[in-house]
């Protein structure tokens, strides 16, 4: 079941999530001067069966001067810094260390994909909350939200999570000593 | 809470202009395209077009292409469809849809009448 | 553009029986199908996405299933409240299409 809305926003901080559930949409969502091709899903999806789970649909890039019933109106001010390189081998990483029945792991890029990713998550999903470059986290409990269904109505747990600023970055998803490396894996995962 | 809130209703003269807006809370606006819906007793539902707000990207259905013409403020969390040259046929009840058509506005009913 | 047929306009059912809603998409679609309910004076509300997966708050007894050509939408234990008009959607090709919806009548 579809989560209603998007987690929760903490100030200087990004989420991530190590794996998503079954029945989870990615947007196919492209750079500037791209959009998605006129054929196929508007989002790919995590589907499979209890012991295997992949992306379906893939997501296409087409130039957007090639289609004469697309336009592109007064473009809007970039709002999102380019994914760093770094920040991928990171989720990467992320994803190459669990294989959970029932999840999909972060999908490759595609071609000409936008720079920040979004995704439609469904109910029980975590997602693991850092801090930005030249912010430390204070906790007061776990770094992550979940989506939860409650008097059948979804929402998300907030993060008990504080971006202070700082110069050093703080460890994903989160503990108490900040590391320049934010490859860490909650103990919890596993398990979930 | 998603919600898209549209007026609920328009009264307008044939030949003129109508411009309607949805009004969007409760997620990143920017992020998801907004689609356009038409309803007409007999006719069902018809996809007019959408708009991306963030990417400013916007797709019509051939058939709509002249009558609608679709904006998006960041600023306000707003779209707009603005149908021109109004006739008998435009009387319909108009929906935008957003989240990869989860969330639907109340429509708003448009009427065209001399 | 890719047609929608829901053959069967209006379907009557009783309370606590099973109904199958039917669309058929005039070419592949894979499974880039969404069904929807709208009940009198209401706008429509999203039931299934991906031809199979609920939105929340959808009861269980809404089941989803098809891919390709053929759809199905089937309400199991049908309640009073399931009374309304239901509509599949392709969205595999621009320009997305509708089915011409389905009328479910209680008797």
């Known amino acids: 079941e579809l989560c209603d809305d998007d987690p929760p926003k903490i100030t200087h901080a990004t989420f991530k999530a190590v794996a998503y559930k079954e029945g989870t949409m990615l947007n196919c969502e492209c750079k500037r001067g791209f959009r998605r091709i006129k054929s196929g899903s508007p989002y790919m999806l995590c589907t499979g069966n209890s012991s295997h789970s992949s992306w379906d649909n893939q997501c296409q890039c087409t130039s957007s001067a090639a289609r004469n019933t697309t336009k592109q109106v007064t473009p809007q001010p970039e709002e999102q810094k380019e994914r760093k390189t770094t920040e991928m081998q990171s989720q990467m990483q992320l994803a190459d260390q669990v294989s959970l029945p029932g999840h999909c792991r972060e999908p490759p890029p595609w071609e000409n994909e936008a720079t920040e990713r979004i995704y439609h998550f469904v109910v029980g999903q975590t997602v693991y909350y850092q801090c930005v470059q030249g912010y430390r986290a204070l906790h007061r409990g776990p770094a992550e939200s979940v989506c939860k269904m409650t008097h059948g109505k979804t929402r998300w747990t907030q993060p008990q999570l504080i971006c202070t600023g700082e110069t050093e970055p703080s460890q994903f998803p989160g503990e108490e000593e900040p590391q320049a490396s934010p490859d860490g894996l909650p103990e919890s995962e596993t398990s979930r | 809470q998603v919600q898209l809130q549209q007026p609920g209703a328009e009264l307008v003269r044939p030949g003129t202009s109508v411009k309607m807006s949805c009004k969007a809370a409760?997620?990143?606006?920017?992020?998801?395209?907004i689609g356009w819906v038409k309803q007409r007793p007999g006719h069902g539902l018809e996809w007019i077009g959408d708009i991306h707000p963030g990417g400013g990207y916007i797709n019509y259905n051939e058939k709509f292409t002249g009558k609608a013409t679709l904006t998006a403020d960041t600023s306000s969390s707003t779209a707009y469809m603005q149908l021109s040259s109004l006739t008998s046929e435009d009387s319909a009840i108009y929906y935008c849809v957003s989240r990869n058509f989860a969330n639907w506005g109340q429509g708003t009913l448009v009427t065209v009448s001399a | 553009d890719i047609q929608m047929t829901q053959s069967q306009k209006f379907m009557s059912t009783s309370v606590g029986d099973r109904v199958s809603v039917t669309c058929k998409a005039s070419?592949?679609?894979?499974?880039?199908v969404a069904w929807y309910q709208q009940k009198p004076g209401q706008s429509p509300k999203a039931l299934i996405y991906s031809a199979s997966y609920r939105y929340s708050g959808v009861p269980d007894r809404f089941t989803g299933s098809g891919s390709g050509t053929d759809f199905t939408l089937t309400i199991s234990n049908v309640q009073s409240e399931d009374l309304a008009e239901y509509f599949c959607?392709?969205?595999?090709?621009?320009?997305?299409?509708f089915g011409g919806g389905t009328k479910l009548e209680i008797k």
């Open positions: 070419q592949n679609v894979g499974t880039n």
């Open positions: 409760g997620y990143t606006f920017s992020n998801y395209w």
């Open positions: 959607q392709q969205y595999n090709s621009y320009p997305w299409t």
